[in-house]
């Protein structure tokens, strides 16, 4: 009797269990009572990444330099191209279809995690004892200067945006 289900890597068509095409190949013709499934390799700029019965291969992703993209990994007949962003930029979304500049951490904030091609800068507020007086995508919060170690005294307290100001100790005469 004609099958109602087929084995793994097969598909049912016209009461026949036909072999699927392997990754990197597309379907040219279904199997028949007398012939195997016929498959053809995907062309240079195309791919299929699963066992399939697709009659067309998928086009490799284009890493558009106008959108700040560059090729991280070249596609093969079995894999898509992987794009990443140029230096100083990161992906706008998980699919990485375009890039945006890394965010800078404003004064009072330091870099907790430097941006990558796929993730933006993560900033954190400078805690007490630390400061950042620049807008930067790289600088962490820096500790206030320790006046004591320089044999100086605090003349002006530090904030999250400014360092302490040290001065000489008043000498008793």
């Amino acid at each position: 009797e004609p099958p109602t289900a087929c084995r793994e890597k097969q598909y049912l068509i016209n009461s026949q269990c036909c072999s699927l095409c392997q990754p990197g190949q597309k379907l040219v013709s279904d199997c028949t009572e007398f012939t195997e499934t016929e498959c053809l390799p995907c062309s240079e700029s195309e791919f299929l990444d699963t066992w399939n019965r697709e009659t067309r291969c998928h086009q490799h992703k284009y890493c558009d330099p106008n959108l700040g993209l560059r090729v991280q990994q070249k596609g093969t007949s079995e894999t898509d191209t992987i794009c990443t962003c140029e230096e100083g930029l990161h992906c706008m979304s998980e699919s990485c279809e375009s890039c945006v500049p890394h965010r800078s951490c404003l004064p009072g904030f330091g870099v907790k995690q430097i941006a990558t091609g796929v993730s933006d800068t993560i900033c954190e507020p400078c805690p007490v004892g630390f400061f950042s007086n620049v807008s930067s995508a790289f600088e962490k919060c820096r500790p206030w200067t320790s006046c004591e170690t320089k044999d100086l005294v605090v003349q002006q307290a530090g904030t999250n945006k400014t360092d302490v100001v040290c001065g000489p100790q008043d000498r008793q005469r």
């Epitope: 028949t32 009572e33 007398f34 012939t35 195997e36």
Partner: antibody
Amino acid sequence: QVQLQESGPGLVKPSDTLSLTCAVSGYSITTNYYWNWIRQPPGKGLEWMGYIKYDGSNNYNPSLKNRITISVDTSKNQFSLKLSSVTAVDTAVYYCARLDYWGQGTLVTVSS
Amino acid sequence: DVVLTQSPLSLPVTLGQPASISCRSSQSLENSNGNTFLNWFQQRPGQSPRLLIYKVSNRFSGVPDRFSGSGSGTDFTLKISRVEAEDVGVYYCLQVTHVPFTFGQGTKLEIK
């Protein structure tokens, strides 16, 4: 329902070329399958001659050497057989077939 | 070329009795995908061949279930569980795993 129908002259002179056509209805020959020519000399068994594929490529029985050509006319949904330099041993019923479906066959006699 | 040898060449059977035809191949008919393209055809007197069994054991649509096929590699069998009057004719095996396709020489089934 797939149907195949052979047509062509029933008498061919020795050394001439035998030409037959197979008209297919109920299925487009460019979709899939191998489209075969098979012959059967009177009172004998079946002999596979060759096929043309849905994509126009073909394969022939080496026993027929360079005498055989199978071609396709997609506009008419038919395929044809040409067998050159025929002799009396080419006298047979000629069938066109998809193998699951066959024509009714046509007798070709080679005689002067 | 692959040679298919059928036995017996003549098979007299009593109505209602079983019948068995053997087809042996000169080389394995199993391809690299594990499929075996061995088919059985019936040719009634004065008619075109008719597909009974494809890929060793699959009955073609409309074929009575008294017909069954079995075997693997180089050894294949067609069985008729209970012969009926309409089963009279010649039975052929055909392999389409290797080009050129080849037929067995045929087994003539007749009623005793």
